[in-house]
């Protein structure tokens, strides 16, 4: 059985205010069973950016259909970028557990920074 890897190919993503940013994340295995969530930052302040199962994330959409059984692409799009959106974003795999899911593996992170405005 292949060990799960969380792939976030971009170390740095330069974005433009008002535009949509795509944060890429793919997994190399369907196991263990459990969701992939998106966060910004690490430690006590880690902020939930997207959770397919619960919550309201009006500016976030998924690139692929996460309900498909064999989906391995957990990339997201964040619309209407503002300066407040800068930071390092992590896709994180959780293993299904009871009563709560348990964090299993994190991607290396993608730093989102503001690029120069188009002239």
């Amino acid at each position: 059985e292949e060990e799960l890897q969380m792939i976030q190919p971009e170390k740095l993503l330069l974005v433009t205010v008002g535009k949509t940013a795509t944060l890429h994340c793919t997994v190399t295995s369907l196991l263990p069973v459990g969701p992939v969530l998106w966060f910004r930052g690490v430690g006590p302040g880690r902020e939930l950016i997207y959770n397919q199962k619960e919550g309201h994330f009006p500016r976030v959409t998924t690139v692929s259909d996460l309900t498909k059984r064999n989906n391995m692409d957990f990339s997201i799009r964040i619309s209407s970028i503002t300066p407040a959106d800068v930071g390092t974003y992590y896709c994180v795999k959780f293993r299904k557990g009871s009563p709560e899911n348990v964090e299993f593996k994190s991607g290396p992170g993608t730093e989102m920074a503001l690029g120069a405005k188009p002239s």
Epitope: L37, F39, R40, G41, V42, G43, P44, G45, R46, E47, L48, I49, E54, G55, H56, G87, V92, E100, E103
Partner: antibody
């Protein structure tokens, strides 16, 4: 953003107390929340935090005695304090933690006094 | 644990003066420093983060600077409402998050 603490009071050494912090004005479940305390006439000391992923963090002096938890359905953060000591006497502030780990909003605090 | 040392402990100044407060870290913290203001009987208020970024609603007379292990908070023209205690906090290493001991800015 509003944070309102409650549950403070006078307790004897070795006793227990549960603090609550009710939040409004933001999507509570998405954000890290923290407790920071201030002993009378002293500076600020970070105590504990619960991240937006539900992970918990403690300063060494309270590990094993304090438990942080949250009820996202009630927009409420808790701090269960057991085996209280005189040195735990302080104003306990609830604070919202930003993604890069500083505190952007604070409650007014609740006073905990540990004395016999 | 990263230790933050603030100096001076107390500063006596007159309104209108320029004030510089210092915060030194026991190791490099990559500019991850925040500054807070606390008035008697009130909760702390965020002023500056990432060493030099002003928080929402903070007047332009407050500015932060520094890198490596030494950071400063400058108040260009002290107003009566600025007399308070000022704390620095490092947000580089979260195990644990630590504050400086504070600097009290009092009326001369």
């Amino acid at each position: 953003v509003q944070l309102v603490e409650s549950g403070g009071g006078l307790v004897q050494p070795g006793g227990s107390l549960r603090l609550s912090c009710t939040a409004s004005g933001f999507t509570f479940r998405n954000y890290g929340m923290s407790w920071v305390r201030q002993a009378p006439g002293e500076g600020l000391e970070w105590v504990s935090a619960s991240s937006g992923s539900g992970s918990t963090y403690y300063t060494d002096s309270v590990k094993g005695r304090f438990t942080i938890s949250r009820d996202n359905s009630k927009n409420t953060l808790y701090l269960q304090m057991n085996s209280l000591r005189a040195e735990d006497t302080a104003i306990y502030y609830c604070a919202k933690v930003t993604w890069n780990n500083f505190f952007d909003y604070w409650g007014l605090g609740t006073l905990v006094t540990v004395s016999s | 644990e990263i230790v933050l040392t603030q100096s001076p402990g107390t500063l006596s100044v007159s309104p209108g003066e320029r004030v510089t407060l210092t915060c030194r870290a026991s190791q490099g913290i990559a500019g991850k420093i925040a500054w807070y203001q606390q008035k008697p009987g009130q909760a702390p208020r965020l002023l500056i983060y990432d060493a030099s970024s002003r928080a929402t609603g903070i007047p332009g007379r407050f500015s932060g600077s520094g890198s490596g292990t030494e950071f400063t908070l400058t108040i260009t023209s002290l107003q009566s409402e600025d007399f308070a205690v000022y704390y620095c906090q490092q947000h580089y290493d979260w195990s644990p998050l630590t504050f400086g001991g504070g600097t009290k800015v009092e009326i001369k």
